[in-house]
Interface confidence: medium
């Protein structure tokens, strides 16, 4: 096991009377339900938590909220709910925070039994509210647009699109029957709408509209569409191809403008297209498997979107619920996480370390014996729990963590075996982006990171018994300390710190309940004096990213670089700080067959790095359709892998002729594109075709 | 079963107003594009007018417009055809029709209007 | 403005014979096309949405085809009830229709 409270650890000096000097309770005195956090701007220190209790009474919920809003990271609370006067705001999605440092805040009220709603504005982080009448009821959390916070989007309840060009002051209806709708970039606006009126029944019948002037003219940009959804630079839709239910995807880079069909396997009805990520580079897309197999393919595209290879078959994506594995570690550049459903059904958790395209078992962690699952008791892999464990209710209480500024770690519920087990998952952390592992605490817990990686905070999951314990560590999770914050435990319900982990506050959420009264309590507690000092250029050591040989001249070179990191020292107790910036030094590598992938109609065997043409195309011309060019493709079978920077070395020779003859992307040719204006506006909102999980760009 | 009841045809002088009614059962109104659509006596078909669903976006037939003014009143399931300005070649049978698909699906019997002094 | 030329004007046949008439757009459509059917005193009938989808309750003797600018309605064995007036409508923008003149059938 880990190193624990013990000789191997060095212990942090006076941790306890530092930590009980810096820990703040508040108590809410109301009998909520459910209570809510959201942060309002970086490192602002505000934060805005809104309780609701709710009571259905007949045909009618009966409800109430109240607004509390802190200034100092959640030591203090101050009641708020007069600057809104009263008013029950709705908890699903009632807060409604705008990007960057705007300051911005709408609050959405439950007005019950009314054809329009209201809305509360701030534009001061909160300190004050403008109440607005609309004249519609959202469906969902008003859309700021990402590029002006004063533009807002909202979805009616009526399948009617609105926009606000004043942070909400006034509203215009722009369309109607509108299915789904998203902001795109430069303030544009991509919308389904559905001209029979069904945004449920007609699936696949859908067109696909962008304005890029907020609503003055439209342009119908796509037709016969199921979904669409954006990743980073990228449109994506999915339509139906006029083989019966048969759809594909269609990809555009210039916002719709023209499209290419992507080379993936048509779907059916039963099965669905899902962006697991994105940039703007290139896409992870889940294609599934016919069937309710509960799998199907990871393919990895092109800088284009259009060219695809397959990069992990047997992909874990449950039909029911949605849920996919699939993670981002964020901590180290090109590393993904996720499941596959093995041919005996078992559950096995793969990583790779390069973007997709080759992926392993996780290593062993070496203080871990293999469990009941494994055939050889010496041969096993770290499996981890991620969203699929939550939704077949084991007791995984987070998903696995990392932070783009905490380089190299990873933590991570998990079991050692041949496959996930269903026993109680202990909590494991990789300080090197996911190569190797150490079991880091016994049994299930909800952990966070703060000041970049300086310090890792853990509470114990208990559901039966109150918690009164905080773990920390501060050297990257192989030794613990355990602090007491009150004597009296509480019922946990979850752990709160800034997003970006750049804070040195932690908040621990809960309440307390006996026969005559409920309610909600926070602690928080700063840990800034345990770190007492800045950390200095001695407080760090230089490690190279993706090493696994340092005895090979391109050891580290993943996507034709190499980085050298500045790491915080383990044995370093300091403060990394909120301005701390990851500094690493790049280097370019070598190009060999590893930095391309294979061209259209090429792929690789299993086991082997040349890609060889696909028997089915040999002798033929390859001719496919771009942009609504017919293009001839000369090629020896590879294409350089999006965002590789390799130079030198093997250098495939690669050709695309433009044959001048007009081809079209199927059913989204631009000449089948139609444009109009709009005096007046009109708009709509329906059901929600795509739904956005956590870490999912798209999914159908 | 889907039923289209159009009203408020008849004789009037050009230049003077008539206001069409078209009451509809059997469907979800509010969730479906209208549209008046004509057949002057003997002719073939001429699309008049189209109104979405939320009443929030029309188009019009560039003969008729700027005198005709399509509407619809959800909570009473009804469509409208306010016709100012009328003139000689507007004499026609005006059906009342329900939008699917790249078409129309149902059709009320029509209500003549003709104009003439 | 998208205008539609419908082909021939009059189509005279017999019952048991095969209609084809045709449509053809100015521009391109995509595939937004419908065909009614007119008997006299009668409001129209849609027959085939979508360029080749047919209507609710409409046999499976009509056909429609083409994407584009050339469309077709196919009437494989004709019966005595389908001589009519048969018109083609597009679609060219979400709340922009015309029609065609129309193509009689009538009786040989």
């Known amino acids: 096991s880990a190193p624990g409270e013990d000789e191997e650890c060095g212990r942090v000096r006076d941790f306890v009377a530092k930590l009980a000097n810096n820990t703040h309770q508040h108590i809410f005195n109301d009998l909520s339900g459910s209570v809510s956090l959201s942060w309002v701007g970086d490192s602002t220190g505000v934060i805005l938590v809104l309780t609701t209790f709710q009571v259905p009474i007949f045909m009618i919920t009966i409800g109430q909220s109240k607004l509390y809003r802190s200034e100092d990271y959640g030591k203090n609370f101050k009641d708020i709910t007069d600057l809104i006067n009263n008013t029950f705001i709705r908890s699903d999605f009632g807060i409604a925070i705008g990007p960057e440092n705007s300051g911005k805040v709408v609050l959405t009220a439950d007005v019950s039994g009314s054809h329009g709603s209201r809305i509360f504005r701030s534009s001061d982080f909160a300190k004050n509210f403008v109440q607005q009448e609309l004249p519609f009821v959202p469906l969902m959390q008003i859309m700021y647009s990402p590029q002006n916070s004063d533009y807002l989007l909202a979805l009616s309840n009526k399948n009617e699109l609105w926009v606000s060009k004043n942070f909400g002051g006034k509203w215009e209806k722009l369309y109607d029957t509108v299915c789904l709708a998203k902001w795109g970039s430069d303030n544009t606006i991509f919308f389904t709408a559905n001209h029979n009126g069904s945004c449920s029944n007609d699936r696949g019948m859908l067109e696909l509209w962008r304005t890029s002037d907020l609503g003055k003219s439209f342009k119908t940009i796509g037709s016969k569409i199921y979904s669409f959804g954006l990743g980073g630079r990228f449109l994506f839709a999915s339509v139906m191809t006029g083989k019966g239910t048969l759809r594909a995807i269609h990809v555009s880079t210039d916002q719709g403008d023209t499209w290419s069909m992507a080379q993936l396997p048509p779907v059916g009805h039963e099965q669905f297209y899902s962006i697991l990520a994105a940039n703007d580079d290139m896409v992870f897309m889940h294609v599934d498997e016919p069937g309710d197999s509960g799998f199907g393919t990871i393919f990895t595209s092109d800088d284009r979107g259009i060219v695809y290879s397959k990069s992990l078959e047997r992909h874990l994506y449950t039909t029911t619920g949605g849920e996919t594995d699939f993670t981002n570690v964020t901590s180290l550049r090109g590393v993904y996480i996720t499941s596959i459903l093995a041919e005996d059904k078992s559950v096995q958790s793969m990583i790779t370390f390069d973007q997709g395209g080759r992926w392993t078992h996780l290593r062993k962690p070496e203080n871990s014996k293999c469990d009941a699952t494994a055939r050889d008791p010496e041969k096993c892999s770290l499996h981890i729990h991620a969203a699929y464990s939550i939704a077949t209710g084991l007791n995984v209480p987070m998903l696995p963590l990392s932070e783009p500024n905490a380089v190299g770690i990873v933590i991570a519920h998990g079991s050692v075996g041949d496959a996930i087990s269903v026993m109680r998952p202990d909590v494991y952390i990789s300080d090197d982006g996911g190569y190797s592992w150490t079991k880091a605490l016994e049994g299930p817990h909800h952990y966070t990171i703060l000041d970049s990686g300086g310090i890792i905070v853990a509470v114990e999951q208990n559901a039966h018994q109150g918690v009164n314990q905080i773990k920390f560590s501060t050297d990257e999770g192989q030794c613990w300390q355990t602090y007491n914050f009150t004597k009296d435990p509480i019922f946990f319900t979850g752990l709160a710190s800034e997003p970006g982990a750049r804070s040195m506050n932690i908040s621990i959420w809960g309440y307390r309940s006996s026969l005559f009264h409920q309610y909600w309590i926070s602690y928080t507690i700063d840990f800034k004096d345990i770190l007492e000092r800045n950390c200095e250029e001695k407080d760090y050591t230089i490690w190279l990213a993706h090493s696994t040989d340092p005895e090979d001249y391109e050891d580290g070179c993943i996507l034709g670089y190499k980085e050298q990191f500045l790491r915080l020292r383990k044995s370093s107790v300091c403060q990394n700080g909120r301005d701390y910036v990851v500094t690493k030094q790049p280097s370019i590598c070598l190009c060999s067959l590893e930095d391309f992938l294979c061209d259209f109609g090429y792929y690789r065997p299993e086991n082997d790095s040349k890609c060889v043409e696909q028997p089915e195309l040999k002798g033929h011309d390859l001719e496919f359709c771009l942009y609504g060019r017919e293009e001839h493709l000369t090629t020896n079978g590879y294409r350089k892998i999006p965002g590789d920077k390799c130079q030198g070395g093997v250098n495939p020779v690669r050709e695309v002729k433009d044959l001048k003859k007009k081809c079209t992307s199927n059913f989204l040719s631009p000449e089948k594109q139609n444009s109009k204006s709009n005096g007046s506006a009109g708009g709509s909102g329906g059901l929600n075709d795509i739904f956005e999980a956590q870490k999912i760009e798209w999914h159908e | 079963e889907v039923q289209l009841l159009e009203s408020g045809g008849g004789l009037v002088q050009p230049g003077g107003s008539l206001r069409l009614s078209c009451e509809a059962s059997g469907f979800t109104f509010r969730s479906y594009v209208m549209s008046w659509v004509r057949q002057a006596p003997g002719k073939g078909l001429e699309w008049v007018s189209t109104i979405s669903g939320g009443g929030g976006n029309t188009n019009y037939t560039d003969s008729v417009k700027g005198r005709f003014t399509i509407s619809r009143d959800n909570s009473k399931n009804t469509l409208y055809l306010q016709m100012n300005s009328l003139r000689a070649e507007d004499t026609a049978v005006y059906y009342c029709?329900?939008?699917w698909g790249s078409g129309f699906d149902y059709w009320g019997q029509g209500t003549l209007v003709t104009v003439s002094s | 403005e998208i205008v539609l030329t419908q082909s021939p004007a009059t189509l005279s046949l017999s019952p048991g014979e095969r209609a084809t008439l045709s449509c053809r757009a100015s521009?391109?459509?995509?595939?937004?096309l419908a065909w009614y059917q007119q008997k006299p005193g009668q409001a129209p009938r849609l027959l085939i949405y979508d360029a080749s989808n047919r209507a609710t309750g409409i046999p499976a003797r009509f056909s429609g085809s083409g994407s584009g600018t050339d469309f077709t309605l196919t009437i494989s064995s004709l019966e005595p009830e389908d001589f009519a007036v048969y018109y083609c409508q597009q679609r060219s923008n979400w709340l922009i229709f015309t029609f065609g003149p129309g193509t009689k059938v009538d009786i040989k």
């Open positions: 029709a329900k939008n």
């Open positions: 521009q391109s459509v995509s595939s937004y």
